[in-house]
Interface confidence: low
């Protein structure tokens, strides 16, 4: 039996059709196609809601870039 076979895996079957303001986003994680039917990005909002988004959409890519820069910038 593979390691962590019982670890929950999250997949996306549908994507949000609404652009989410980057100010409402706290983090994201990528979902790879080997585990799921579709490649996806799951954004976690500041109220801890998880939302599936299409990584091919420009706003999704821009939001990921923004969050990446946020994590690289040390908080004062």
């Amino acid at each position: 039996q593979p390691d962590a076979i019982n670890a929950p895996v999250t997949c996306c079957y549908n994507f949000t059709n609404r652009k989410i303001s980057v100010q409402r986003l706290a983090s994201y994680r990528r979902i790879t196609s080997s585990k799921c039917p579709k490649e996806a990005v799951i954004f976690k909002t500041i109220v801890a809601k998880e939302i599936c988004a299409d990584p091919k959409q420009k706003w999704v890519q821009d939001s990921m870039d923004h969050l990446d820069k946020q994590t690289q910038t040390p908080k004062t």
Partner: nanobody, 123 residues
Framework: EVQLVESGGGLVQAGGSLRLSCAAS????????MDWFRQAPGKEREFVAA????????YYADSVKGRFTISRDNAKNTVYLQMNSLKPEDTAVYYC????????????????WGQGTQVTVSS
Amino acid sequence: EVQLVESGGGLVQAGGSLRLSCAASGRTFSNYAMDWFRQAPGKEREFVAAISKSDGSTYYADSVKGRFTISRDNAKNTVYLQMNSLKPEDTAVYYCAAEGDSSPMGGVTYDYWGQGTQVTVSS
């Protein structure tokens, strides 16, 4: 808690067929969308097919489309994977999984897994 037990695996020649079964016990089976995954030696677990709990909608990985068919029998608490035109690259341990709650935006978490059944396709 849901218990899932797979069966139907075995050794088959390329081009042959197998039908896998996944029997569920525990909570109401019809409350769950059901999925098949597979894991080949040294490789990552891979999505194969899914069937919804409500309308029987099905989803397939590109690698199995047209060859594999997922179905379910809620009266028997069982989900099936009919595998035709098998190829050596289909060799793997096949696992069924029960989907937990899904979010409005389509995120799905797999809460329960079976122990797996070995499928070996020889050339």
